[in-house]
């Protein structure tokens, strides 16, 4: 009588997924810029700000065609992971100047935990190298000052901006790939 | 609907070897990281392999290490795991799953015995 | 001995709630990798039943929910019933192992 039917397709293809996973990072990368413009009409930023315990920018726009899913998907789980560790400390030591910022900053932690689990999964379906989600990291330092809590929403804004920039572009590159 | 059928399963002595195949359809097939888990008489599932949905990347349970070869064919949709140097340790119910594994065939006996 | 440990048994009236549990390590589940869980109906193929610790598949009804904190992961089914009599098993990906680990296998049994 021939094989017994199989399941109905229970969850999505991880093509759709990595469309889901697209449509995700874009909406973030518009809290992220929106929170960015909202810290900057409170506390005008005087230069750019850096922040040593920041991942650097994992690749330019111009280097994306050489790039293989594996390392993107792996090296964009852990930039945003160290910014999500990040935005977590920002919220708990940035000190009351910051608490202004509420309660989108909470809202752009809970998106980043959530993109952060839909590339977890997205590597579990491809049955990709698994790094630990994560990872021990040493705690970072409360910031000197007032001024310190806020220098470093900047550059964890900006960093994060640009880290989502460039995962928009790379997860679109890699769909053709898929 | 998509669907897992596994084939290649039987009787075969110690030392012996056997290949499975897994026929996939109703999905995209090269797009799923592929599983092989096994299931001795009444006992629980045990994940034997997995490979990549290209085929790059592939692991092992220790229990198969070196005896077992997991592949693929994502142009006819079909997973293979080559067994040899089987033991009476190794009969179980083969189940090949995609994804998670989100998908899962009904499964090939494999019995080792002499 | 499964990397990944749950009860044997568990039991419960139909109407009842009941969970199950299933505790890892810090290479599984404390590690940070999520817990997916199946249902195996006697004689048949397992069936994915919970995926990303708390994500229901189509098609699984609202009554079964998961959960997971530290290097422990929980699986409740409420409203029970004769039907939900299966074997149930937690699985997560193990970094010392480079592929998922399964729990024992838990026995339902609906009295």
């Known amino acids: 009588p021939g094989p017994p039917p199989g399941p109905p397709r229970v969850s999505p293809d991880p093509r759709a997924e990595l469309d889901s996973t697209v449509l995700l990072t874009r909406s973030l990368l518009a809290d992220t810029r929106q929170l960015a413009a909202q810290l900057r009409d409170k506390f005008p930023a005087d230069g750019d700000h850096n922040l040593d315990s920041l991942p650097t920018l994992a690749m330019s726009a111009g280097a994306l065609g050489a790039l293989q899913l594996p390392g993107v998907l792996t090296r964009l789980r852990a930039d945003l992971l160290s910014y999500l560790r990040h935005v977590q400390w920002l919220r708990r030591a940035g000190g009351s100047s910051l608490k202004t910022l509420e309660p989108e900053l909470g809202t752009l932690q809970a998106r980043l935990d959530r993109l952060l689990r839909r590339l977890q999964l997205l590597m579990s379906r491809l049955a990709l190298p698994q790094p630990p989600p994560d990872p021990p990291a040493p705690p970072l330092a409360p910031p000197s000052s007032a001024w310190g809590g806020i220098r470093a929403a900047h550059a964890i804004l900006g960093g994060l901006h640009l880290t989502l920039d460039w995962a928009v572009r790379g997860l679109l590159l890699l769909k053709t790939r898929l | 609907e998509v669907q897992l059928l596994e084939s290649g399963g039987g009787l075969v002595q110690p030392g012996g070897s056997l290949r499975l195949s897994c026929a996939a359809s109703?999905?995209?097939?090269?797009?799923?990281?592929m599983h092989w888990v096994r299931q001795a008489p009444g006992k629980g599932l045990e994940w034997v392999s997995v490979?990549?949905?290209?085929?790059?990347?592939?692991y092992y349970a220790d229990s198969v290490k070196g005896r077992f070869t997991i592949s693929r064919d994502n142009s006819k949709n079909t997973l293979y795991l080559q067994m040899n140097s089987l033991r009476a340790e190794d009969t179980a119910v083969y189940y090949c799953?995609?994804?998670?594994?989100?998908?899962w065939g009904q499964g090939t006996l494999v019995t080792v015995s002499s | 001995q499964s990397v990944l440990t749950q009860p044997p048994s568990a039991s419960g009236t139909p109407g009842q709630r009941v969970t199950i549990s299933c505790t890892g390590s810090?290479?599984?589940?404390?590690?940070?990798?999520?817990v997916h869980w199946y249902q195996q109906l006697p004689g048949t193929a397992p069936k994915l039943l919970i995926y990303?610790?708390?994500e229901r598949p189509s098609g699984v009804p609202d009554r079964f929910s998961g959960s997971k904190s530290g290097t422990s992961a929980s699986l409740a089914i409420s409203g029970l019933r004769s039907e939900d009599e299966a074997d149930y098993y937690c699985?997560?990906?193990?970094?010392?192992?480079?592929?998922?680990?399964f729990g024992g296998g838990t026995k339902l049994t609906v009295l």
């Open positions: 490979i990549s949905y290209d085929g790059s990347y592939k």
């Open positions: 990303s610790n708390n």
């Open positions: 699985a997560a990906w193990d970094n010392s192992l480079n592929g998922p680990v």
């Open positions: 799953a995609a994804g998670v594994p989100d998908y």
């Open positions: 810090s290479s599984n589940i404390g590690a940070g990798y999520d």
């Open positions: 109703g999905f995209t097939f090269s797009s799923y990281g």
